[in-house]
Amino acid sequence: AITEAREEAKPYPLFPGPLPGSLQTDHTSLLSLPHTSGYQPALMFSPTQPGRPYTGNVAIPRVTSAGSKLLPPLAFKHTVGHIILSEHKDVKFNCSISVPNIYQDTTISWWKDGKELLGAHHAITQFYPDDEVTAIIASFSITSVQRSDNGSYICKMKINNEEIVSDPIYIEVQGLPHFTKQPESMNVTRNTAFNLTCQAVGPPEPVNIFWVQNSSRVNEQPEKSPSVLTVPGLTEMAVFSCEAHNDKGLTVSKGVQINIKAIPSPPTEVSIHNSTAHSILISWVPGFDGYSPFRNCSVQVKEVDPLSNGSVMIFNTSASPHMYQIKQLQALANYSIGVSCMNEIGWSAVSPWILASTTEGAPSVAPLNVTVFLNESRDNVDIRWMKPLTKRQAGELVGYRISHVWQSAGISKELLEEVGQNNSRAQISVQVHNATCTVRIAAVTKGGVGPFSDPVKIFIPAHGWVDHAPSSTPAPGNADPVLII
């Protein structure tokens, strides 16, 4: 039989009163033993055989010191088997054994749940010698018990290479419920059911759960732990917690906020970082995500021009980074730009629109009617062309770039010349004789260099050859121009 010491009676619904055979008393007075004498209370003996030592795990000494008669078997005396107490209280329990004086150097060790307790534990062993035997009392005390002190404690004594083991003493530390699982904050879809979980443990058991939503109890009756609450859907943010109850009282979980997913707020602070003739680099600050991660964003671009058809160009981009290079724009044009982002619920409204402009573009056409003459007397090549018909967006013509490539006997050399916008002719020095000179011309604006004209080739003879025939840009569709000598 297990003798059980209880700190207090359990009210309904666990137990209606003290258990049969239990000891209803203050734990410290029950379990302390006097240290000043060898007195041992009856509690230390087995309740099944009053006055007889417990003989569960024994060592049998063979003879007395006189070598004549057998000694009784050695065993720890039976003690209290189960101690129930509240967290933060102090407890003291002990083992006792009477050992014939023939044995020397007997030591008692304490074990908890199969592991020896070493170091900073309050274990005291006291010896009470008599004529033939020594009573040994090993006390173990714990101050301010915690749940981690729960377990089965035993004494062990080594004697003559035999191990004597006491009956276990079960320590049950009771306290308020302890949460092993609490509800977690969540972001949920409007009017969609979801689950919350709450789990708490004792001892004492049972632990009962009440759910609380926005300060109102969800379940009128307690539910056994663990409990899963299926929330049937929310239309607005709510705060949930759970109460765990046992006979010691109540513990309340953390309150968790459940948010309702919504469309994001519009982005703010759309800014222009860089403009070129055909692209604009923008950035924005994302709005509130509506409790659901952004999926992507949409950049909307409208041309601000009374003559434009007012159509909107839409460029889809990832939500991060919060930047986008808008391409394929007209040069020297004004645009209105807005940004919208989406999450799983839908698209945000568009950000406040901002105005942005592209810069001048490079010319889109090459100079026309390029002709090339050899002026042998001056050792020059004369080049003439007609100004290209550039669009307004290309900006103002600032000049021309002339590329002339000299090729002879496997050697090739390209040279570039810049001339002003008022010119439509240029002269370049002959670089190499007995060579071919290939000329191309491009118009230049602040926006950049336009396309080069089709190449015009002229052969530069060795000194003494006379030839003034021009080379010129062919009419569209003709083959590459060549010098006709």
Partner: antibody
């Protein structure tokens, strides 16, 4: 299947007492509260209160304290409504209903008509 | 206590004509439940927690709302839907019912 079966109609004189029973079956009685609802002739539903079947603790709505008593016999999974010092205005159909989360009454008894007349 | 006001008190409809029943609370509530009652019968659960159909309830019934304003809709009433409908709030004690809306055949 879940069922709540109420006792039969009662005809009582003013000042007398009546005890209406509500026997539950098809579920664990102690897991769900029992609500009581009154409906006077030609009137709407009026919540009287409920009893916690786990602890036996009753909760009464305003206007239903004093003469009205909710009780249990868990051994037979039965809830009771007792009304003492009956008055003519207590004439009504009394319903019991099983309460679940969010105070929703998912199963109802068939109702017990209590008539108070001299 | 939270007072629930149902409107209209009576709704006269032809079968198939959409029915919209309103339940207003004197202060914000978490959920609204709806029950149907026919003469001589116990109330029957209809909608749980604002918008969830009770078992066996046909899809022509739907519930919506939040805060202080809740609605029960019968998209195309059948002859068996003509009855009295009650709302009941969950938020605070005491649990209160609305006064009921009678849906009758025009």
């Amino acid at each position: 299947q879940v069922q709540l079966v109420q006792s039969g109609s009662e005809l009582k004189k003013p000042g007398a007492s009546v005890k209406v029973s509500c026997k539950a079956s098809g579920y664990t009685f102690a897991n769900y509260g029992v609500h009581w609802v009154r409906q006077a002739p030609g009137q709407g539903l009026e919540w009287m209160g409920w009893i916690n079947t786990y602890q036996g603790e009753p909760t009464y709505a305003q206007g239903f304290t004093g003469r009205f008593v909710f009780s249990l016999d868990t051994s037979v999974s039965t809830a009771y409504l007792q009304i003492s010092s009956l008055k003519a205005e207590d004439t009504a159909v009394y319903y019991c209903a099983r309460g679940v989360r969010y105070a929703y009454m998912d199963y109802w008894g068939q109702g017990t008509l209590v008539t108070v007349s001299s | 206590e939270i007072v629930l006001t149902q409107s209209p008190a009576t709704l006269s409809l032809s079968p198939g004509e959409r029915a919209t029943l309103s339940c207003r609370a004197s202060s914000s509530v978490g959920y609204m439940h709806w029950y149907q009652q026919k003469p001589g019968q116990a109330p029957r659960p209809l909608i749980y927690a604002t918008s969830n159909l009770a078992s066996g309830i046909p899809a022509r019934f739907s519930g919506s709302g939040s805060g202080t304003s809740y609605t029960l809709t019968i998209s195309s009433p059948e002859p068996e839907d003509f009855a009295v409908y009650y709302c009941q709030q969950w938020s605070s004690n005491p649990r209160t019912f609305g006064g009921g809306t009678k849906v009758e055949i025009k």
